[in-house]
Each structure stands twice: as C-alpha cells, then as structure tokens.
Interface confidence: medium
Amino acid sequence: GITNINCSGHIWVEPATIFKMGMNISIYCQAAIKNCQPRKLHFYKNGIKERFQITRINKTTARLWYKNFLEPHASMYCTAECPKHFQETLICGKDISSGYPPDIPDEVTCVIYEYSGNMTCTWNAGKLTYIDTKYVVHVKSLETEEEQQYLTSSYINISTDSLQGGKKYLVWVQAANALGMEESKQLQIHLDDIVIPSAAVISRAETINATVPKTIIYWDSQTTIEKVSCEMRYKATTNQTWNVKEFDTNFTYVQQSEFYLEPNIKYVFQVRCQETGKRYWQPWSSLFFHKTPETVPQVTSKAFQHDTWNSGLTVASISTGHLTSDNRGDIG
C-alpha cells in the first residue's frame, strides 16, 4: 500500500486514520526535505490533486479539510514544490478508511448439517461496516463450564470433534472493529436438536394417463435419521402462490408422492426436510420443473449435475440444469 513509501516528512489524520463515515476530517502534511523551503504543499486523493479546503499552517505544514467524508477507502499523499526542483517532491502517504462500528449481532443460529462433521454458526451482522470487522464466537459447555473462542470474519465451522463438553452449550458472538465492539445475546443449544438431515433431492417425475391423470414425484435423501418430516411445495410457474404438502418420511427407499395436477401446465416443485420435532429445516431443494401432458404420459428427470433414471414410457425429457431455489438460506 501507500504506507510503504519512503517519506520526507509526515502525514497524519485527525481524528484518526480509521473514522466514522460522514465525519469531518483533517489531513495534515508536514515536510522535512533537505534544502527545501516548500513554496507550496499539495494533497492528492487516489492520485487526483485536491484544489480546495487546503490551509497553510506554517512554513512546513498544511492542512486539508473534508466535510462529511463518505468514501470507505482512500489513498492520500502530499507533495512539496521545492525551489530549484522541476518536479514536486513526495513527502508522505497514508491509506485512510471510514466506516461504522458493528451492530449487535443477532439471529445467532448453529446447525449441524448431517455428514458435515461441523457445527455451522451464522448470525445477522447488521449493516455493512465498510472496515475490517472481526467476530469472536464463544462456545461454552453448560456441563463442564469450559469455554472455547473462535475468531472469524463471517460465519464459523466448528468441528463436532472439538465439542467435547457434552451436548449442551451456550453460544454468543462478539463483533469488533476499530470503531467499536458489540455482543450478541446467548443462544442455548443441544447438539441433538440442531442436526439438519442430508439434502433431499427430487430426481424425476412422471404423469400417468389414467381416468384422472396423476403425477408421481420421485425423491430421496441419504439421511440416516429415522424420523424425518418433509414439505414439498409446488405451483404452476405462472402462479405466485405455493401449495404445500407435508410428509412423515422414512428414507429407506425412494419416496413417491402423488399429485393431481391440471393438464398441459408447467409446474415447479421443491422439497425440504427436518428431523421430526426439531427446529431447523433444510434449505429448499433445487427447482424441479415438470410439464403435465395434454393426454400422453410424460416423464421428467433431474439430478444435480447428473442425469438420472427415467422410465421407458412414451414421452420423456431430461432436465439437467442446476437451478438454485429462491431462498436457499431458509433454515428457520
């Protein structure tokens, strides 16, 4: 950065190099150049010479004043016009930053995604601070009273192997930057209550042409959790409102769910599951599209980036695009 340059003087910022966005600030430049009584002192911001609000304080020092400074980062340097020098002489430079103190972290959430081997903790950090903000996640065992701390810039993955203090913990988050520090409320967790089952996947759909045409959605999960509750939501792609069907599921075989849908309409399906009676849901699965036929039977098939099985019925189509859901982060 600009702070690494060789200086022939001094540059400093009041109230500080990192300050609250919107403040009035002063940048001072003091020359200390051999055999030079500066005729003029110049300030540059991000390489552009400043023309206004410069005050000469004495023979070697000048001040640049900014009202309501709103830029998150700027590189400042100052130069001197020395007699008998054709070019301006560099005095010194400094990187300055403006931002906000952190908000109180809220909505602290910790989950264990099945098979991940980690407890993932997230929180709402509040408004953007614009400056380097660190978070310390405190995890305290309610059984042993032992506390562990983890430093991070965003969320944190904590290996479940490191959670040796039983099943019950308190978790809270401290946010800190150069402008302030805040602490969240404490979240009490039980490790058995925060497991989210392995993702459910809709793999294919078929419409059977009976007296009343019936669409069967095939879906599965690799979860080993025995009691799982799932929701499948579906709607015509032209509609805003979702219909939701609930299922109590045992994933020892491929699930088949039946729907009676309107003919010749494109529908979209998503599924999500949770361990029965627990708090957190999976994110909704990828969007799965299926167009119901006018009369003939139809099969649609999809797996993440892979093709998957489809039956030998007369009309078949494969959809392999990976379309993410409209709210993948919804685990509450």
Epitope: V201, Q222, S311
Partner: nanobody, 124 residues
C-alpha cells in the same frame, strides 16, 4: 422386472483402460442405488463403486480410488465404470447391481438385482 445387462469387459495389458456399461430395464428407476461389484476366482464378491442416482453421489473401494470412476446417463438408463491404470489384481468378473432399499453401501448383500457379469482380464 428389473434387468441389468453389462458390457465392455475384455482383456487388457496392465496400465490400460476399459469402460464397462450397465444398461438397466425401465423398472430400475425405482432402485435407490446402483453399483459395480467384482468377484475373482476363489474369492468373495466385493464392492467396487456405487452411485446414488438421485444426486450423483459416489462411493469407491479404497483399492480403486483415483483409478476407477462410476457415472450415469439417465437418458440411456445406463451406469458406467471407467477403469484406468488397470492392474493384474483387478482381474475378475464384474457385476452391475441395483439396490431398491438401504444405504450407499459396498456390501453385496444390500443389493437386490444383479446382472450376469462381464469378464475383465488384466495381464502383466
């Protein structure tokens, strides 16, 4: 009725490659897992690789990791086993199998449906 038909076996020199295919009858789409297994003369049948058709997740035996790749083509209702850097100890009858229930296991007893097998011979 679920039917599985393997092809692609043959003889190859050590270090060579083969690609096995397993074509499934329409009924196989209800299977939860598909897998490749092998049986050398005088030895028990062992798991090589399995795939979860819904999501494409795969599991490999330690002895073939990094050399063999299991994949699928849903449109053709086919599972493949790409075998690279073959060794003489890979010589065996290779079977395709489908499991209607259960987990992604390399244990043969969890699989309900079996093909007739295709012979792979690797000479040094």
């Amino acid at each position: 009725q679920v039917q599985l038909q393997e092809s692609g076996g043959g003889s190859v020199q050590a270090g060579g490659s083969l690609r096995l295919s397993c074509a499934a009858s329409p009924g196989t789409y209800t299977s939860r897992y598909m897998g490749w297994f092998r049986q050398a003369p005088g030895k028990e049948r062992e798991g090589v690789a399995t795939i979860w058709p819904a999501g494409g997740n795969t599991v490999y035996a330690d002895s073939v990791k990094g050399r063999f790749t299991i994949s699928q083509d849903g449109a053709k209702k086919t599972v493949y086993l790409q075998m690279n850097s073959l060794k003489p100890e890979d010589t065996a009858m290779y079977y395709c199998a489908a499991a209607k229930y259960g987990g992604t296991s390399l244990a043969p007893y969890t699989y309900n449906y079996w093909g007739q097998g295709t012979q792979v011979t690797v000479s040094s």
